[in-house]
């Protein structure tokens, strides 16, 4: 599987997340349609449903076994790790900030009377 | 959970990955100790072993149920998505920001205060 390349400042891994997945992430882990109590966390099926929503390429309608879902989860984590293991591009420098004129050292001011003869 | 902050050009999400985990990621799914064919991934136990290797905070020695492993996997995926949704560090002066970064749409920025519980 190829590494995910930057697309418009984000990455395919992120850009291909469904709006639904992003909405769930924003909603502190709550699916928009359900407000279930924490006790249901122990239900394995809920975890698989959650993974289906989070991982691109695991659409809800498809019939995937738990093993197939886990395989796609593993692939997705590997892709995210590969992208993040490469440092983000950075700028060459910060903005140019002038030295305060009052603090200019003598060496930085070229005197006009030393411009005439080649020593 | 707090947002993952840049650390020396990489991110805590990556920095906290064990060397082994990164080596696995670079090897595109091959554990350093085993060169198993992909067919073995069909075994559910192999998938969980693999996830234990890939996800920080799921050490091999600990006794975690499959549900607990999946919960940590979900948390980790959400964290990686959050980091990738954040634009790369840029120069402090706005006008010089490259178009890619400046064009990041709000929908791509995932809220940082999410928790992943399997709802």
């Amino acid at each position: 599987m190829k590494a995910l390349s930057p697309v418009r400042g984000c990455y395919e891994a992120v850009c291909c997340l469904s709006e639904r997945s992003l909405a769930i992430a924003r909603g502190r882990g709550k699916s928009p349609s359900t407000e279930e109590p924490l006790s249901l966390l122990d239900d394995m099926n809920h975890c698989y449903s959650r993974l289906r929503e989070l991982v691109p390429g695991v659409p809800r309608g498809t019939q995937l076994s738990q093993v197939e879902i886990l395989q796609r989860v593993i692939d997705y984590i590997l892709d995210l790790q590969v992208v993040l293991a490469e440092p983000a591009p950075g700028p060459p420098d910060g903005p140019h900030l002038p030295i305060q004129t009052a603090e200019l050292t003598p060496e930085l001011v070229i005197s006009k009377d030393k411009r005439s003869f080649c020593h | 959970m707090k947002a993952l902050s840049p650390v020396r050009g990489c991110y805590e999400a990556v920095c906290c990955l064990s060397e082994r985990s990164l080596a696995i990621a670079r090897g595109r799914g091959k554990s350093p100790s085993t060169e198993e064919p992909l067919s073995l991934l069909d075994d559910m136990n192999h998938c969980y072993s693999r996830l234990r290797e890939l996800v920080p905070g799921v050490p091999r020695g600990t006794q975690l149920s499959q549900v607990e492993i999946l919960q940590r996997v979900i948390d980790y995926i959400l964290d990686l998505q959050v980091v990738l949704a954040e634009p790369a560090p840029g120069p402090p002066d706005g006008p010089h920001l490259p178009i890619q970064t400046a064009e990041l749409t709000p929908e791509l920025v995932i809220s940082k205060d999410k928790r992943s519980f399997c709802h």
Epitope: E86, P87, A88, P89, G90, P91, P92, D93, G94, P95, H96, L97, P98, I99, E103 | P6, R8, G9, P89, P92, H96, P98
Partner: antibody, heavy 111, light 111 residues
């Protein structure tokens, strides 16, 4: 406003060495600091920088052997490992914008 | 990226004009992130021009920078004896490493 390098000395190959850039008249929390070196009679060579926020970037040749870190609001270190004779040079630090440079500190790597 | 400067040395007469070129193998950041420095023996570099054409404070207006993208020029008009030095261009790039690269330097000899 000025910067000054220190820590340069004669070392044998393989010896690690740490140089320090000390800022006067401004805080490093607001500026990038660059490290640049110049071998005798050779061109300037950019090593890397640490940003105001602490992010570091390096020349590809310097990655792994050179580490830049902020040690206080007025000091930045350049840690160098696995030094060879090729690393003999005057090492400069420069403030963001490259408009303030230190006088440089000489590092000599010799047997 | 690689920055290639006019071969050294370049000779000029007092009152004459000197042109030094700097070519980058890839476009600099923002198409203008290129600086020029003057360095005299035993001294740190001194910033003359930044962002291709902006004159640093205290630098005589005889120094002019121009160019865009990959091709840049430093022009010194009404050359003075004090201009005898080595001149370096510095390209900046938005990248994961080698964010700043110096040219090889051009020595200017004033006759």
């Amino acid at each position: 406003q000025s910067v000054e390098e220190s820590g340069g000395r004669l070392v044998t190959p393989g010896t690690p060495l740490t140089l320090t850039c000390t800022a006067s008249g401004f805080s490093l929390s607001s500026y990038y600091i660059h490290w640049v070196r110049q071998a005798p009679g050779k061109a300037l060579e950019w090593i890397g920088y640490i940003s105001d926020g602490g992010t570091t970037y390096y020349a590809s040749w310097a990655k792994g052997r050179f580490t830049i870190s902020k040690t206080s609001s007025t000091t930045v270190d350049l840690k160098m490992t696995s030094l060879t004779t090729e690393d003999t040079a005057t090492y400069f630090c420069a403030r963001q914008g490259f408009n303030i440079w230190g006088p440089g500190t000489l590092v000599t790597v010799s047997l | 990226a690689v920055l290639t400067q006019t071969p050294s040395p370049v000779s000029a007469a007092v009152g004459g004009t000197v042109t030094i070129s700097c070519q980058s193998s890839q476009s600099v950041y923002n198409n203008n992130w290129l600086s020029w420095f003057q360095q005299k023996s035993g001294q740190p570099p001194k910033l003359l021009i930044y962002e291709t054409s902006k004159l640093e404070s205290g630098v005589p207006s005889r120094f002019k920078g121009s160019g865009s993208g990959t091709q840049f020029t430093l022009t010194i008009i009404d050359v003075q004896c004090d201009d005898a030095a080595t001149y370096y261009c510095l390209g900046g790039y938005w990248t994961t490493s080698d964010n700043n690269i110096f040219g090889g330097g051009t020595e200017v000899v004033v006759k």
